[in-house]
Interface confidence: medium
């Protein structure tokens, strides 16, 4: 029974075998399922842990120690229990074949037996000795892991919270990245795509010259409209001529008509009589210049001055100086009226700003500016605003003081970068600032985490794209 | 009511081609990115294609295993959105969706494409 | 390109119960991910999106939740209209990619 020997079977077991004799007495002594082994994934983001990594590493392996020293146990009681049956059968043995003569070996036997018991007493006392010794060292280990726990806790908070620092300064940058990365590929496709393309450029002028034709009729139909109500107006003055008696206080039928049909602004097409919506013929003050604007004489009282529109992405804002100048897109649609209108119009008299915006899940907010003008193009457009009310944020999405304008080829803004290039679309940029309603036009459900979309910080956060949007301008006496 | 309705499914010999209809109503299908979804018989959903409008042009994207064998277009006086199959592989075969913007909240019924000798 | 992996591939389930169906992105897809509920011959319909936005008239026991790489559809009490194959998506970037599906199963 001393040739004993220790092994691994098939399944992972430790395995103990005892030779006695002609028999043979193998001990399979089980492994606790809890315990993972050190080859065995484990993957955690450290920063959302309760405790360090070397924490949870030390309670792993003081789990594998007690597993070890649970086995351990389990394997001595079993030795001990084995080696008292093997004494009983022994001593059964003597007794049963020993006669008077076989005394002294007997006693040999008995002696080896106790020699042999004492040996494994021995070493069970050494075994438990290095148990309790290593338990021992552990319980200091992990006690001295708990005491530093806190210390590490806390330093994972900080740097949880630098953490959360960093990645609002990358979220920008990553939303950067992707947009690269998006015309990255669309850069790849180019080639393959160039005959696709082509075809896609045929059909899209063809859709273009089909809105085109429909486009000229609604013109001609308004037209149509435009010259009857002119062709009334003209017979209402001539009628107003005829019945003044005095003929000093008569005047060039010619001049009266130009009088009535040239407006400034849609306040005062409304305050003319025209309280339809639609498009209007404006005229710049102090000039003969001329500029087509929609109206809207239903909301809020009328007389609104639309001066941008956005609702479909139809048209692109990623334009230059001169034609944020002048002005681009279809009045009937997406539109900017132009800023040299615009600054005219609003230096000559007082003007409040009205901005309309709509969400994709059907909301509308807006924010009214009591005061607004342009400034110059000698001073970039830069614009004014004071006293902010509505419904989109009580601070205003437009940086105060006002910025001057930028454009693709016109950066005017407070970046080291050009907003205008990285945001797409001219505005008046801060650094890059809190709105941008000339962005990129977004759809439904592809509308979020856009940072180069229609923007306006304060009522739906930075990386919110707009469903539609109008800027409307009107006399603040209206 | 939005509706999406697909047609123009059949079965075509292996190098054949086909081209795909979607006619669309309910909803600014100017302003929709619109998409070609398919899913083979028993298997998941695996997308094919996009057409989006970037302010006032149309841009495409195609899933790698299409890429220069199919087109997306489409004719905006028509409502409608085509997927032109060329050069037809028999791993092709499978029902083809229509649906907006994605993630897509609006999607057609399905036309079955068979590719087989 | 991102993949998208699903788990489980199936699961069984009684009416009543909770169920929650994972999926990870291989990258970071910010919060652009979808869930679709796909039943036998029929289209797709769209339940999630932003990863934890109800489309609307889906009912309140779908909720959706997860950003960056980690994502997950919970049906809080399964209904028997629920038996369905249900599929995650991310719309972040080229090429959209789906997960492999799930399909719930009557115990």
């Known amino acids: 029974y001393n040739n004993f020997r220790k092994s691994m079977d098939s399944i992972g077991k430790k395995q103990y075998q005892v030779q006695h004799g002609s028999c043979s007495y193998t001990f399979l002594l089980p492994e606790m399922d809890n315990c993972r082994s050190s080859s065995s994934p484990y993957v955690s983001n450290a920063v959302q842990r309760d405790a360090p990594l070397e924490y949870d590493d030390s309670v792993q392996r003081l789990q594998v120690l007690e597993n070890i020293m649970e086995n351990n146990t389990q394997w001595l009681m079993k030795l001990e229990n084995y080696i008292q049956d093997n004494m009983k059968k022994e001593m059964v043995e003597i007794q049963q074949n020993a006669v008077q003569n076989q005394t002294a070996v007997m006693i040999e036997i008995g002696t080896n037996l106790l020699n042999q018991t004492a040996e494994q007493t021995r070493k069970l006392t050494d075994v438990e000795a290095q148990v309790l010794n290593q338990t021992t060292r552990l319980e200091l280990q992990l006690l001295e892991h708990s005491l530093s726990t806190n210390k590490l806790e806390k330093q994972i908070l900080d740097q949880t919270s630098e953490i959360n620092k960093l990645q609002d300064k990358n979220s920008f940058l990553e939303k950067k990245v992707l947009a690269m990365e998006d015309k990255h590929i669309i850069q790849l496709q180019s080639i393959k795509e160039e005959k696709d393309q082509l075809q896609v450029l045929v059909s899209k002028q063809n859709s273009i010259i089909e809105e085109l034709e429909k486009k000229i009729v609604t013109a001609t139909v308004n037209n149509s409209v435009l010259q009857k109500q002119q062709h009334d107006l003209m017979e209402t003055v001539n009628n107003l001529l005829t019945m003044m008696s005095t003929s000093n206080s008569a005047k060039d039928p010619t001049v009266a008509k130009e009088e009535q049909i040239s407006f400034r602004d849609c306040a005062e097409v409304f305050k003319s009589g025209h309280t339809t919506n639609g498009i209007y013929t404006l005229t710049f003050p102090n000039s003969t210049e001329e500029i087509k604007a929609y109206c809207d004489m239903e909301a809020g009282g009328g007389g609104w001055t639309i001066i941008q529109r956005r609702e479909d992405g139809s048209v692109d804002f990623q334009r230059t100086w001169k034609e944020y100048k002048v002005g681009f897109g279809n009045p009937s649609g997406e539109y900017w009226l132009g800023n040299e209108f615009v600054s005219q119009l609003t230096n000559q008299q007082r003007y409040v700003l009205k901005i309309h915006l709509k969400d994709w899940e059907g909301n509308e907010a807006y924010s009214l500016y009591e005061h607004f003008y342009l400034s110059s193009e000698e001073l970039n457009y830069r614009i004014h605003l004071k006293g902010l009310t509505g419904t989109a944020g009580k601070i205003s999405s437009i940086s105060q003081p006002g910025n001057d304008f930028s454009t693709k080829d016109g950066d005017n803004d407070k970046c080291i970068c050009k907003c205008s290039q990285m945001l797409t679309g001219g505005w008046w940029f801060d650094a890059c600032g809190p709105s941008n309603l000339n962005g990129m036009y977004y759809p439904q459900r592809q509308n979020t985490n856009k940072f180069n979309g229609i923007k306006w910080y304060y009522w739906k956060g930075s990386g919110y794209s707009l469903k539609a949007t109008t800027m409307m301008i009107r006399p603040a006496d209206f | 009511e939005v509706q999406l309705v697909e047609s123009g499914g059949g079965l075509v010999k292996p190098g054949g081609s086909l081209r795909l209809s979607c006619a669309a109503s309910?909803?600014?299908?100017?302003?929709?990115?619109m998409n070609w979804v398919r899913q083979a018989p028993g298997k998941g959903l695996e997308w094919v294609a996009e057409i989006r409008l970037k302010s006032n042009h149309y841009e495409t994207h195609y899933a790698e295993s299409v890429k220069g064998r199919f087109t997306i277009s489409r004719d905006v006086s028509k409502n409608t959105v085509y997927l032109q199959m060329n050069s037809l592989k028999t791993e092709d075969t499978a029902v083809y969706y229509c649906?907006?913007?994605?993630?897509?909240?609006?999607w057609g019924q399905g036309t079955l494409v068979t590719v087989s000798s | 390109d991102i993949q998208m992996t699903q788990s489980p591939s199936s699961l069984s389930a009684s009416v009543g119960d909770r169920v929650t169906i994972t999926c990870k992105a291989s990258?970071?897809?910010?919060?652009?991910v979808a869930w679709y509920q796909q039943k036998p011959g029929k289209a797709p319909k769209l339940l999630i999106y932003w990863a934890s936005t109800r489309w609307t008239g889906v009912p309140s026991r779908f909720s959706g939740s997860g950003s960056g790489t980690d994502f997950t559809l919970t049906i809080s009490s399964l209904q028997p209209e629920d038996f369905a194959t249900y599929y995650c998506q991310q719309t972040s970037s080229y090429p959209l990619t789906f997960g492999g599906g799930t399909k719930v199963e009557i115990k």
């Open positions: 990258q970071y897809v910010f919060t652009d």
């Open positions: 649906t907006d913007t994605q993630p897509g909240a609006y």
């Open positions: 309910g909803f600014t299908f100017r302003a929709a990115w």
